[in-house]
Interface confidence: low
């Protein structure tokens, strides 16, 4: 009678009660031995790394039957030692052993390369009992072998705390070559040598390599794997692959593109992110990098005014981020801006030029030639000045701000006056007699208030005393003050 059982996660007793399909009705063992506590039969297949093979061994039981007849040593029967088969084929192998019926709870486990195969569905144990011994055949099957199934398989049985190990069964799965290293895409300098590597393995060995460039074989004679192809240089893009051949056939690697480094394409989408009176923040999208990383970029700026001398300002910056603040520009001016970037090969063409304008700013200089004098008859102080140079107004003048501070013993009072843009003189009332009046003037645009002029002081006497001499600030570069009376 035959009993076939898929292994479960508990020890399978040799005789679990009356034996199904058996003619015998009583299978009480002569001697009951406890099985190794917690020992689990493990019959799941799971690929592992190759390890060292196990040689078979035997257990010599010390137990004797009631008749005291010594038992023979237990050992697995010899079986096929080496199986060679093609990938995706099915394989079944087994190990068998005859065990005296005095032993109970015997389990067989499968091991591959030193690791137990847990939870498999490929392992079946069959029992063939007779009067004195039970023949046990443990079969292991793989429906579609893969390379990872290569290795050394053994059976183990535990009896009376002894371990019996079968001779190894070596499984060798042969198939098409398998790439362990394929060529990789590269960016190379024109006419410069470079290497490509290709490596493939069997079994079966040897594996021979042919190189292919743009669909044509490079080498007439194959090279044994691994192979390094030295390409003396290219002038244009090429696609390389390698063919790996063994007795089972041929495998072709992925095709890799070898690009020739070139100057980059010009940047695109140059745009204005922010404008102030003296700076413009720009961003751009880099063009194609020519298969070589961008190193830096150049921002070219020229005045868009047709009357300008056409000179170009150049600002260099790193390639990242794609953003640059152009500084030291004139207020309320129009500029043409272009961007060019470089890689190790050279500079790109300039991007399409864009037009940008700076905003209005506060004036950068104070009014010039400020003159102050007392008009005692009307009890006023007259103030006169010259407007700042147009270039330094940084916008359209909307007026002037006058600060006048009156100081006498223990009193200090500051007043502010605003005057329109057309004036270059102002009259303020005397606030305090027998005091010093300090005057400063600043130009004003929509962009803000500019710097105040240097202070000009005048003494305001008590009533009845006249000072005809005005106070003033000199114009830059003039030795003598220009007095406007």
């Amino acid at each position: 009678a035959i009993t076939e059982a898929r292994e479960e996660a508990k020890p399978y007793p040799l005789f679990p009660g009356p034996f199904p399909g058996s003619l015998q009705t009583d299978h009480t063992p002569l001697l009951s031995l406890p099985h190794a506590s917690g020992y689990q039969p493990a019959l799941m297949f799971s690929p592992t790394q190759p390890g060292r093979p196990h040689t078979g061994n035997v257990a010599i039981p010390q137990v004797t039957s009631v008749e005291s007849k010594p038992l023979p040593p237990l050992a697995f029967k010899h079986t096929v030692g080496h199986i060679i088969l093609s990938e995706h084929k099915g394989v079944k192998f087994n190990c068998s052993i005859s065990v005296p019926n005095i032993y109970q709870d015997t389990t067989i486990s499968w091991w591959k390369d030193g690791k137990e195969l847990l939870g498999a569905h490929h392992a079946i144990t069959q029992f063939y009992p007779d009067d004195e011994v039970t023949a046990i055949i443990a079969s292991f099957s793989i429906t579609s072998v893969q390379r990872s199934d290569n290795g050394s398989y053994i059976c183990k049985m535990k009896i009376n705390n002894e371990e019996i190990v079968s001779d190894p069964i070596y499984i060798e799965v042969q198939g098409l070559p398998h790439f362990t290293k394929q060529p990789e895409s590269m960016n190379v300098t024109r006419n410069t040598a470079f290497n490509l590597t290709c490596q493939a393995v069997g079994p079966p060995e040897p594996v021979n390599i042919f190189w292919v460039q743009n669909s044509s074989r490079v080498n007439e004679q194959p090279e044994k794997s691994p192979s390094v192809l030295t390409v003396p240089g290219l002038t244009e893009m090429a696609v390389f692959s390698c063919e790996a051949h063994n007795d089972k056939g041929l495998t072709v690697s992925k095709g890799v593109q070898i690009n020739i480094k070139a100057i980059p394409s010009p940047p695109t989408e140059v745009s204005i992110r922010n404008s102030t009176a003296h700076s413009i923040l720009i961003s751009w999208v880099p063009g194609f990098d020519g298969y070589s990383p961008f190193r830096n970029c150049s921002i070219q700026v020229k005045e868009a005014d047709p009357l300008s001398n056409g000179s170009v300002m150049i600002f260099n910056t790193s390639a990242l981020p794609h953003l640059y603040q152009i500084k030291q520009l004139q207020a309320l001016a129009n500029y043409s801006i272009g961007v060019s970037c470089m890689n190790e090969i050279g500079w790109s063409a300039v991007s399409p030029w864009i037009l940008a304008s700076t905003t209005e700013g506060a004036p950068s200089v104070a009014p010039l030639n400020v003159t102050v004098f007392l008009n005692e008859s009307s009890d006023n102080v007259d103030i006169r000045w010259m407007k700042p140079p147009t270039k330094q107004q940084d916008g359209e003048l909307v007026g002037y701000r006058i600060s006048h501070v009156w100081q006498s013993a223990g009193i200090s009072k500051e007043l502010l006056e605003e005057v329109g843009q057309n004036g270059s003189r102002a009259r303020i009332s005397v606030q305090v007699h027998n005091a010093t009046c300090t005057v400063r003037i600043a130009a004003v645009t929509r962009g803000g208030v500019g710097p105040f002029s240097d202070p000009v002081k005048i003494f305001i006497p008590a009533h009845g005393w006249v000072d005809y001499a005005p106070s003033s600030t000199p114009a830059p570069g003039n030795a003598d003050p220009v007095l406007i009376i």
């Epitope: 593109q257 992110r273 961003s283 999208v285 990098d289 298969y291 990242l320 981020p321 794609h322 953003l323």
Partner: antibody
Amino acid sequence: QVQLVQSGAEVKKPGASVKVSCKASGYTFTTYDINWVRQAPGQGLEWIGWIYPRDGYTKYNEKFKGRATLAVDTSTSTAYMELRSLRSDDTAVYFCTRGYYDNLYYFDYWGQGTTVTVSS
Amino acid sequence: EIVLTQSPDFQSVTPKEKVTITCSASSIISSNYFHWYQQKPDQSPKLLIYRTSNLASGVPSRFSGSGSGTDYTLTINSLEAEDAATYYCQQGRSVPLTFGQGTKLEIK
């Protein structure tokens, strides 16, 4: 540490609009772009657009142009994404992310996401 | 629009295994513009690798990236249980910015 905290989940009817907020902290808000990315249930990531908080400069995925509006409030370091004319296929988790000036690069910080459900 | 195609869509692997995810672009991209993200269930994506091969802050050294032209690879050496996630590639070469469809990694 850098944090992007988004507003809570929203349920909307088809045709309606939704406005999701993203409050940034732990860095200078105006120095980095805020990008918006969405992820439909069980799907991949889809970029909507970016805004540069310093000047409000925006760039949109053509697919969302006209329906999505990105905005910022620099006084509160908050970015907003409004999506109009909602359809059922706009049901997704919407993420705000931080990107350097150099807006064509990677997103180094992400908000926790805001689930928007569009259902009649 | 640059289309990124990841392979495989799904992979079930055991701990300690080496995992390779590839991302193929519809046109050539400089390695500066190529990045990888990790997204665990019910979490926001997290920057994993930027500019092809640079590990983002706090990312374990078992992660690495390589590639050029149109083909880019994310490799995880000796997978750990915490690496179960969906991985996305992303290009920053041109607008619209695009992502791969994702590769879901399951730990057996």
